[in-house]
C-alpha cells in the first residue's frame, strides 16, 4: 500500500466565487475517497467534481475532486480522504 | 470476507429509545464508511445516515433530531441510536459498508437486518 | 428531498423472460443511480451501480441503463433465482432515496 499525497488549491471562479480542488496522487491501490465538506457535513454529489482515478505512470494513481465555493467561506470547507484504512481531512489554503 | 451483522432489542415500548449495535468483519472501520437504512414493512427503504471512517456523520434532514450514530473502531462495532419512538418507527433496520469512488457512491455489502416492533 | 418513483409495484413473466423494471426521478441525476435485489428472506444485494456498471459477482444477465431522470434494470434471461423486488436509489442529492421496489414473480 502506498498512501497518497493530498494537495488543495483555489481558483477564481467568477465574480465572489472560487474553485477548490482537492488533488490525491501517488497512491496505491486505486480505490481512494475524496470528497468535499462543508462545515463537517458532506457535500451532494451533484455539487462536486470527480476526475477519474488515472495511472501516474510510477504504478501508482492520481485523482481530484473540485467544488465551487462562496469567497471568504474557505474555513467553512475541508477536502475529506480515506485510503487503505487510513483518513485524513485537508483545509482550504487562505 | 466482509459481514456486517445488526442486533436490537426486538421490542420498544412507544416514547423509548431505540438501541441497534452493527458488528463488522473483514474491513476496518477506519477506512470505509458504514449507513444505517431501514424499512417498515411492506414498505421501501430509507436511509437513515452514515458514519465515516474519521467518526464524522451525516443524517437525514427528517431524522437528524432523533438520530445518533456512533462507532467503536477497536471492536469492529457502530451504533444506531434513535429517540422517542412511535409505531411508524416499526421496521426491519440494516447496516451496510459504503462505498465511495468519485462518481460511484453505493452500498456494495448489507447485512441480514434486525427487526424493530414499537408496541406498548 | 429527490422522489424516485417506479411505476410497475410487481409483475409477472416467465422463466427466459427479458424482463425490463423502470425508474424515474423527480429531477435530473446525472447517472448517479443504484440498484439493489432484495430477496424474500429480506437479504439484500447490489447490482448496478452508477447506472450501468455490474458489481463484481452479479450474472451478466443484468444490466442498467439510462440518462437524466428516467433509468432502467434489465434481466435479459429470467432465472428462479431472481424472484426478488428490485429497488433503485438515487445519490446525486443528499438524503440517498430509494424507490418503492418492482416485486418480480414467476408467471
Known amino acids: 500500500t502506498v498512501p497518497p499525497m493530498v494537495n488543495v488549491t483555489r481558483s477564481e471562479a467568477s465574480e465572489g466565487n472560487i474553485t477548490v480542488t482537492c488533488r490525491a496522487s501517488g497512491f496505491y491501490p486505486w480505490n481512494i475517497t475524496l470528497s468535499w465538506r462543508q462545515d463537517g457535513v458532506s457535500l451532494s454529489h451533484d455539487t462536486q467534481q470527480w476526475g477519474d482515478v488515472l495511472p501516474d505512470g510510477n504504478g501508482t494513481y492520481q485523482t481530484w475532486v473540485a467544488t465551487r465555493i462562496c469567497q471568504g467561506e474557505e474555513q467553512r470547507f475541508t477536502c475529506y480522504m480515506e485510503h487503505s484504512g487510513n483518513h485524513s481531512t485537508h483545509p482550504v489554503p487562505s | 470476507q466482509v459481514q456486517l451483522k445488526e442486533s436490537g432489542p426486538g421490542l420498544v415500548a412507544p416514547s423509548q429509545s431505540l438501541s441497534i449495535t452493527c458488528t463488522v468483519s473483514?474491513?476496518?472501520?477506519?477506512?470505509?464508511?458504514v449507513n444505517w437504512v431501514r424499512q417498515p414493512p411492506g414498505k421501501g427503504l430509507e436511509w437513515l445516515g452514515m458514519?465515516?471512517?474519521?467518526?464524522?456523520?451525516d443524517y437525514n434532514s427528517a431524522l437528524k433530531s432523533r438520530l445518533s450514530i456512533s462507532k467503536d473502531n477497536s471492536k469492529s462495532q457502530i451504533f444506531l441510536k434513535m429517540n422517542s419512538l412511535q409505531t411508524d418507527d416499526t421496521a426491519r433496520y440494516y447496516c451496510?459498508?459504503?462505498?465511495?469512488?468519485?462518481?460511484?457512491?453505493?452500498?456494495?455489502?448489507w447485512g441480514a437486518g434486525t427487526t424493530v416492533t414499537v408496541s406498548s | 428531498d429527490i422522489q424516485m418513483t417506479q411505476t410497475t409495484s410487481s409483475l409477472s413473466a416467465s422463466l427466459g423472460d427479458r424482463v425490463t423494471i423502470s425508474c424515474s426521478a423527480s429531477?435530473?441525476?446525472?447517472?448517479?443511480l443504484n440498484w439493489y435485489q432484495q430477496k424474500p428472506d429480506g437479504t439484500v444485494k447490489l447490482l448496478i451501480y452508477?447506472?450501468?456498471s455490474l458489481h463484481s459477482g452479479v450474472p451478466s444477465r443484468f444490466s442498467g441503463s439510462g440518462s437524466g431522470t428516467d433509468y432502467s434494470l434489465t434481466i435479459s434471461n429470467l432465472e428462479p433465482e431472481d424472484i426478488a423486488t428490485y429497488y433503485c436509489?438515487?445519490?446525486?442529492?443528499?438524503?440517498?432515496?430509494f424507490g418503492g421496489g418492482t416485486k418480480v414473480e414467476i408467471k
Open positions: 451496510a459498508r459504503g462505498a465511495y469512488y468519485g462518481k460511484r457512491w453505493y452500498f456494495d455489502v
Open positions: 473483514g474491513f476496518s472501520l477506519t477506512g470505509s464508511g
Open positions: 458514519i465515516w471512517g474519521d467518526g464524522n456523520t
Open positions: 429531477q435530473g441525476i446525472s447517472n448517479y
Open positions: 452508477y447506472t450501468s
Open positions: 436509489q438515487q445519490y446525486s442529492k443528499l438524503p440517498p432515496t
